[in-house]
Each structure stands twice: as structure tokens, then as C-alpha cells.
Interface confidence: low
């Protein structure tokens, strides 16, 4: 049809730099060259409908959808997204083509969907359909590894159903506690799926691919170790495999191990035993309890008993869905400028969380440490005494958790002053928030001690800069004050700071720092 306009649909991918957040479409961002989206007429549709290629976008990416229309005369347009109409302002480029743009900043799930652009020209009306989806990260997965018994062998297979296929490694350690940290010389790594040496103190399996690294520890009760003050607890989701290892060492082979669930012996086929002699001729026995796919009724106290050691138990809890338990109430802290201080979040979670600490839109790495009582803790000490709002965010695939912290640094006020033709303003970020006084300097009061009682407007905490409160005070100028020096002072329990301003002088205002 010769009436149909020549249309080009393009995608512009913006390289995000933080300053672009929330800015209007005219704000400059670093861009890739435009990508042709090959707008084609949609067959058998009522009216003239063009369809662009689907655009798949990374979470937090910023893009522009753009239509270039080669049609004579003016055009008017309307964007529609999820039944809401959005403003549309066409303009013309140097080739006199109509240009219509839709900017999507910091792509989120809520911005995914169909964007309809209705264009009306002098010749015809038509619709352009853009489909924007979040990048399908389901194609990339990294799942926590789990264990299976190798058929007809006393060995464990480590499995991680991940894409791309992960590299699987066993991480073994024969020491206790801190010395089993990843880079410790006591740690041995074996890049293989099957493990035959199952007598070690600490056994973990890790899987890694482009998405990162996930590990699972073989849950162990050691009858030769003093039991923890709180009962060890193991969480699993319905359908996951259960593996618990009971380990005991004795001077000779004359002892046996048994597993019980709530005082009932485990069924045949739910356990297997291995034994070996150690270098000092003592006997090591291990007894595995396993369930290939747990159900709710597998919940309970699993007790490992020995004829020569005190028995020990662990509580296995089967949940339908993962969880993160922690108090999410926000916490405010007030510290001195050189005081050592760390934020801390104590939580219980299953599966293990991934977490970040955020301040001023910058994310910081998050470390977590397991405590003896089944809880974990994450601390953040790298605040560099910057006041403001700090956010702890955790997720584990099933649950999300966010906690806010506010850090206030006790310090005397520092005053910044500015003036316009009609008013003078002072602001300060000291803490506790300062109070203000204004003084007039004159022949009668060369030390600027004369109070200005009227025209002062104080705004406490008027703007929050990443959680940092700022207090300001404004003096509205009367004709009588013009040409005078005035002094604004901010004071709190830690001290006072002043700034002197010349009202209504020609040219830029000189600020005289008053010590």
C-alpha cells in the first residue's frame, strides 16, 4: 500500500552509569549504536499494525525504544503500557523524519510487557507493538549441590543441576573450625563428582559456573566432640534429599552405631555404614542416614547412638518453602567520629542467603558467619564514618528480607551559606541537628551580637541525602538590611559554627569564614 509510511524501529542500549538514575529522556547516557528491530507489518490484524522484534533486557539495564517515521506532514502519537497512556512527544531529525522515543531506565519486572505506540499522521493511522522482556536468566541456573549414594559402592556423588554445566569439586578438611576456611592449607580440593573418602572431619561439595559458586556441607554429628549447647538443626525443603553422617572413633572395633528417628530405628535401606582404621590403629566408624526425597513426616529428632559413646541428636525440620527469619525493624545508631562500630544482622535462613549491604546506591560485599545456635550473622564495618542510611538485603530464591539502618555521626555543625537578592540561607549537616541564630553586624554591633528577631525561617531536616539529615535556616531580607553584614550560627551540644554574609552586594557574594 503506497499510503503506508516507511517505518524504522530501533533499540538504543544505554551503558548505565549511576547518575542516570531517574533522569528524563534528555539526560545524556553513554549509548551503543542503535539496533534495528525490524518492524514488520503484522498479518491478519485489524488496522495497520507493525511489530518489532522482542527486546530482551538485563535487569537494571537502560534502553530507549525509538520509531523513525518517514511520512509527510505532522504526526501525533500516544504510548500505551498496561492500559495506561503515557506522554508522547514526537520531534523531527535532520532528515526530517518523525522521531518518537520511549526511555526505560533501570529495567525491572514491572516494566516488562507490551508497549503500544499509536501514531496518527495526515495520511493514515497505525500501531506499533514493542515487546520488552526481562532477560531469561532461567537459561542460566546455578543450583545448590546435593548428594546421592553411588550404586553398589560406598561413595557419594555430588550433583548440581545447573546451566551451563558446572564444575563440581569436593572441599575436604580434617581440622576443626576456623582452620577449615577456604584458603587454609588444611583444605584439600578434589575436582570430581564422586567421593570415596568419607571419613574426613569437614566435607563440602561445591558447584561453580558463570553465575558463581554454591556449596553444600555434609551434615555431621561427631560423637567424640562435646555436643553444642543448642541442638544442631538441619532444614530441608519437601522433596530434597536428606543426608546425615554420624562419626565415632574408638580404641578398637568393638562398638556399633545406630540411627533412630523419634526413638524408632530407621528402616532398612535408609542407612549405610563404613569403617576404617586410622594411622594410630583406632577404629573410625561412620553411619549415614539418608532419605532420597524428604516429606513432612521425615521431620523430627534424629539420634545417633553408640555402644561406647554418649548419643547425640539433631533436629531435622522439613519446610514447604524456604525462609529468612530476622527482625526487620529499622535501627538507628549514633556514634562519635572515631568510634569503632559495625552494623550487624542476626538471622536464621534456609536455603543459605545471598546478601548485600548498600549505602548511597553503592553495593558492598556481604559476608555471613554461622553461629553455634543455628543462627547466622552478617556484619558491616566499612561505613568509613559516613552518616546516612544503610540497607541490608538478603534473598535465597524463596524469601527476601530487607533491613534499614541509620548512622548518625556526632559532630559539631559546619555551615554553608548562600544569598540571593531577597534572602540569605545557611545549612548544616552537624549532628545532633543544630539550632540557629542570626546576628546583625553594624557600627553599634561590630562583633555581630545584635539579634535579628524577625524574618527567620528554620527548616530542620529538610532534605535527606541518602539518609543524612540537613538542617537549614533562611533569613528573608528587608530593605533596611541591604548592604549589612549578617552572621548565621549553627550550634549543637558539640559546638558552634558561624558564617558571615554580605547582603545584596553587587557581584558574587563574598563569604567570610568566621572561626
Amino acid at each position: 500500500n503506497q499510503d503506508l509510511p516507511v517505518i524504522k524501529c530501533v533499540l538504543i542500549n544505554h551503558k548505565n552509569n549511576d547518575s542516570s538514575v531517574g533522569k528524563s529522556s534528555s539526560y545524556p547516557m553513554v549509548s551503543e549504536s542503535p539496533e534495528d528491530l525490524g518492524c514488520a507489518l503484522r498479518p491478519q490484524s485489524a488496522g495497520t499494525v507493525y511489530e518489532a522484534a522482542t527486546v530482551e533486557v538485563d535487569v537494571s539495564a537502560s534502553i530507549t525504544l525509538q520509531v523513525l517515521v518517514d511520512t509527510p506532514g505532522n504526526i501525533s502519537c500516544l504510548w500505551v503500557f498496561k492500559h495506561s497512556s503515557l506522554n508522547c512527544q514526537p520531534h523531527f531529525d535532520v532528515q526530517n523524519r518523525g522521531v518518537v522515543s520511549m526511555v526505560i531506565l533501570k529495567m525491572t519486572e514491572t516494566q516488562a510487557g507490551e508497549y503500544l505506540l499509536f501514531i496518527q499522521s495526515e495520511a493514515t493511522n497505525y500501531t506499533i507493538v514493542f515487546t520488552v522482556s526481562i532477560r531469561n536468566t532461567l537459561l542460566f541456573t546455578l543450583r545448590r549441590p546435593y548428594f546421592r549414594k553411588m550404586e553398589n559402592q560406598d561413595a557419594l556423588v555430588c550433583i548440581s543441576e545447573s546451566v551451563p554445566e558446572p564444575i563440581v569439586e569436593w572441599v575436604l578438611c580434617d581440622s576443626q573450625g576456623e582452620s577449615c576456611k577456604e584458603e587454609s592449607p588444611a583444605v584439600v580440593k578434589k575436582e570430581e563428582k564422586v567421593l570415596h573418602e568419607l571419613f574426613g572431619t569437614d566435607i563440602r561439595c561445591c558447584a561453580r559456573n558463570e553465575l558463581g559458586r554454591e556449596c553444600t556441607r555434609l551434615f555431621t554429628i561427631d560423637l567424640n566432640q562435646t555436643p553444642q549447647t543448642t541442638l544442631p538443626q538441619l532444614f530441608l525443603k519437601v522433596g530434597e534429599p536428606l543426608w546425615i553422617r554420624c562419626k565415632a572413633v574408638h580404641v578398637n572395633h568393638g562398638f556399633g552405631l545406630t540411627w533412630e528417628l523419634e526413638n524408632k530405628a530407621l528402616e532398612e535401606g535408609s542407612y549405610f555404614e563404613m569403617s576404617t582404621y586410622s594411622t594410630n590403629r583406632t577404629m573410625i566408624r561412620i553411619l549415614f542416614a539418608f532419605v532420597s526425597s524428604v516429606a513432612r513426616n521425615d521431620t523430627g529428632y534424629y539420634t545417633c547412638s553408640s555402644s561406647k559413646h554418649p548419643s547425640q541428636s539433631a533436629l531435622v525440620t522439613i519446610v514447604e518453602k524456604g525462609f529468612i527469619n530476622a527482625t526487620n525493624s529499622s535501627e538507628d545508631y549514633e556514634i562519635d567520629q572515631y568510634e569503632e562500630f559495625c552494623f550487624s544482622v542476626r538471622f536464621k535462613a534456609y536455603p543459605q542467603i545471598r546478601c548485600t549491604w548498600t549505602f548511597s546506591r553503592k553495593a558492598f560485599p556481604c559476608e555471613q558467619k554461622a553461629l553455634d545456635d543455628g543462627y547466622s550473622v552478617s556484619k558491616f564495618c566499612n561505613h568509613k564514618h559516613q552518616p546516612g542510611e544503610y540497607i541490608f538485603h538478603a534473598e535465597n530464591g524463596d524469601a527476601q528480607f530487607t533491613k534499614m539502618f541509620t548512622l548518625n555521626i556526632r559532630r559539631k555543625p559546619q555551615v554553608l551559606a548562600e544569598a540571593s537578592a531577597s534572602q540569605a540561607s545557611c545549612s548544616s549537616d552537624g549532628y545532633p541537628l543544630p539550632s540557629w541564630t542570626w546576628k546583625k553586624c553594624s557600627d553599634k554591633s561590630p562583633n555581630c551580637t545584635e539579634d535579628i528577631p524577625e524574618g527567620v525561617w528554620n527548616r530542620k531536616a529538610n532534605r535527606k541525602v541518602f539518609g543524612q539529615w540537613v538542617s537549614s535556616s533562611t533569613l528573608n531580607m528587608s530593605e533596611a538590611m541591604k548592604g549589612f553584614l549578617v552572621k548565621c550560627c549553627a550550634y549543637n551540644s558539640l559546638g558552634t559554627s558561624c558564617e558571615t554574609i554580605l547582603l545584596n552586594s553587587p557581584g558574587p557574594f563574598p563569604f567570610i569564614q568566621d572561626s
Epitope: N13, E32, E35, L37, A53, T54, N136, L139, P164, E210
Partner: nanobody
Framework: EVQLLESGGGLVQPGGSLTLSCAAS????????MGWFRQAPGKEREFVAA????????YYADSVKGRFTISRDNSKNTLYLQMNSLRAEDTAVYYC??????????????????WGQGTLVTVSS
């Protein structure tokens, strides 16, 4: 289903050049973002370069910027990697990769749906 077959690897001296090709079977080659990854001995697989479905956008790892050029010929169902100023640290198995099936993937590390078998590039004097 897309099958990818790399070729062009071999032994080359430091400072030399090499062009890798990746032939794709299947009629949907032009609808995929394509990329090259590499894996050096004892190291993890790493992103090298990627190209959008139409070829108008290219992405590179910092370590190869200015030395490697990725391109594609949709009419021949072929992806290329022109490697200049090769260094010993470029020694690796190079894998061709096809991204998600949508026609535009806005990312510097495409979601990989299909992998080739790899071709070995050795840079040594």
C-alpha cells in the same frame, strides 16, 4: 536446535594473527546473539566477545579490546573472531556460543543456550 562447529585454531607466534570461524546449522542463526568464550588450562571459562543478532552491536572483554574483532555473516550462518597482536595469555580453548532465542539481547555476557565443542589456540614462540 542449533549445532555450532568452530574451526581456525592452531599454533601461532606472539604478535601474530588468527581468524576463528563458527559454522552454525539451522535456519535460525540470524535470530541469536552470538559470542566467543575461552577457557585456559586450569582456569574458568571467560567471556571474550559478543555480537547482537543483526551485527550492529558488539561487546568485548577488556583484555581483548582493540585486538580482537567479532563479526557475523547471517547469509552464511557463520560467526568470526579476528584475533590480532596475540599474546601468550590468549592461549585457550575458544568456544562459540549462541544466546537466547529473542532477536535482541541487551547484555555484555549473553545468556548461552548452545555451545560449540571448542577449538584450541596456542600462542607460543
Amino acid at each position: 536446535e542449533v549445532q555450532l562447529l568452530e574451526s581456525g585454531g592452531g599454533l601461532v607466534q606472539p604478535g601474530g594473527s588468527l581468524t576463528l570461524s563458527c559454522a552454525a546449522s539451522g535456519r535460525t542463526f540470524s535470530s541469536y546473539a552470538m559470542g566467543w568464550f575461552r577457557q585456559a588450562p586450569g582456569k574458568e571459562r571467560e567471556f571474550v566477545a559478543a555480537i547482537s543478532w543483526s551485527g550492529s552491536n558488539t561487546y568485548y572483554a577488556d583484555s581483548v579490546k582493540g585486538r580482537f574483532t567479532i563479526s557475523r555473516d547471517n547469509s552464511k550462518n557463520t560467526l568470526y573472531l579476528q584475533m590480532n597482536s596475540l599474546r601468550a595469555e590468549d592461549t585457550a580453548v575458544y568456544y562459540c556460543a549462541a544466546g537466547g532465542s529473542t532477536r535482541v539481547v541487551v547484555t555484555t555476557t549473553p545468556v548461552v543456550k548452545y555451545w560449540g565443542q571448542g577449538t584450541l589456540v596456542t600462542v607460543s614462540s
